[in-house]
């Protein structure tokens, strides 16, 4: 019961986390204009991974996509890659974990297969969460560096009178969503891995016993009943970890159309 609860909770927490990672990746507010010096601004700038936007005091908002790949900073590309890898791994992990849930019966799938799948999805969630946390942290570091650089060059004199005031950017809401979502996915993955240990059946060795039926001298070896009883030394469920070899009960999952942003 505790194992089912742990697995179910791990799945739900990971699901919320991955939804959060997707939301953070799509959000426009990764960096927002710093309003420390001017809390009432006429033009409020904010930027995401895919486009930059302006909200005017008139109420109008306009966004411009980054319509170039080569012209973008390498760090931004790296953050995009980390977030997408996190989403894809998380999505595959979710698909695998659905089939691994103890409360869902699929054919004659055995506990060892479910344990394997639970572990696989757990690892995927952990890596997914780490990718998201890494991506958000890299972006945050980039912001901090740029913030202090633009503070140092806040006013660049041009011909004495003209000033170029650099727009400083600070942490946007997407960063916090990403950190929390990555953390939740990571926690969900750990819970799945813990649940996997409980799902794995104990290895039981039954000794061959000779049964003597009265009046007959025929010895019955339990190995002969293995197909129906599951007894015997070479049963399918004896070995918990099979080094990645898949049984025919396991379902391989591929990224579906919903796995892509």
């Amino acid at each position: 019961m505790a194992v089912t609860a742990c697995q179910g909770l791990g799945f739900v927490v990971s699901l919320i986390g991955i939804a959060g990672i997707i939301a953070a990746t799509c959000m426009d507010q990764w960096s927002t204009q710093d309003l420390y010096n001017n809390p009432v601004t006429a033009v409020f700038n904010y930027q995401g991974l895919w486009r930059s936007c302006v909200r005017e005091s008139s109420g109008f908002t306009e966004c411009r996509g980054y319509f170039t790949l080569l012209g973008l900073p390498a760090m931004l590309q790296a953050v995009r890659a980390l977030m997408i890898v996190g989403i894809v791994l998380g999505a595959i992990g979710l698909l695998v974990s659905i089939f691994a849930l103890k409360c869902i019966r699929i054919g004659s799938m055995e506990d060892s297969a479910k344990a394997n799948m639970t572990l696989t999805s757990g690892i995927m969630f952990i890596v997914s969460g780490l990718c998201a946390i890494a991506g958000v942290s890299v972006f945050a570091n980039m912001l901090v560096t740029n913030f202090w650089m633009s503070t140092a060059n806040m006013y660049t004199g041009m011909g004495g009178m003209v000033q170029t005031v650099q727009t400083r950017y600070t942490f946007g809401a997407a960063l916090f969503v990403g950190w929390v979502a990555g953390g939740l996915t990571l926690i969900g993955g750990v819970m799945m891995c813990i649940a996997c240990r409980g799902l794995a059946p104990e290895e039981t060795n039954y000794k061959a016993v000779s049964y003597h039926a009265s009046g007959h001298s025929v010895a019955y070896k339990p190995g002969g009943f293995k197909a129906s009883t599951g007894f015997g030394s070479n049963t399918k469920n004896k070995k918990i970890y099979d080094g990645g070899a898949r049984t025919e009960d396991e379902v391989q999952s591929y990224p579906s159309k919903h796995d892509y942003v």
């Epitope: 033009v43 930059s52 005017e56 008139s58 306009e62 170029t164 005031v165 727009t167």
Partner: antibody
Amino acid sequence: QIQLVQSGSELKKPGASVKVSCKASGYTLTNYGMNWVRQAPGQGLEWMGWIRPNTGEPTYAEDFKGRFVFSLDTSVATAYLQITSLKAEDTAVYYCARLYRGNTLDNWGQGTLVTVSS
Amino acid sequence: DIVMTQSPDSLAVSLGERATINCKSSQNLLSSGNQRNYLTWYQQKPGQPPKLLIYWASTRESGVPDRFSGSGSGTDFTLTISSLQAEDLAVYYCQQGYSFPFTFGQGTKLEIK
């Protein structure tokens, strides 16, 4: 079509108060900010400030803090400018203007001349 | 506050000729978020309120004749009337909408030579 209709000219004595109204039609007043602009006789345009449409919160330019008050009455789709303790230098044409895309003033009232004279 | 400086203060141009008015701001008006310049041009005829001509430095307002065009970026902007008509005689103002308080140029009076 969009129209901003302002109240008529006012002649006031120094120290008095005046309230200029600006009635909006053809659009929803609460969807757009309302700006106030002053133009002294023979002079250029001076932005006095604006009032946020959703909150009704006014923002005043430095020279217009204190004696100038912007307000909205959404029930009659009207914006108001009140000036207290009038001085001779307040003599000007006062315009209301709608804030639009690009932070531009796209529609203007016809203007209200306020004359302060003893 | 951002200071807007127009030049010249007055301009006399023959009908059918090109008229050019300049506007310089004390700060950059280019927004990094949408790559727009928050500069607007207005036309004011005697006894009338100002009329919006061009916003975002170069976008013509609907209904404005195409002889009016705006250009420039950052801190230097230009309003050009390609072929001056009698009805274009007015005072022209530039205004920045990049930061509060919004500020206007002192105006350029356009007259017939």
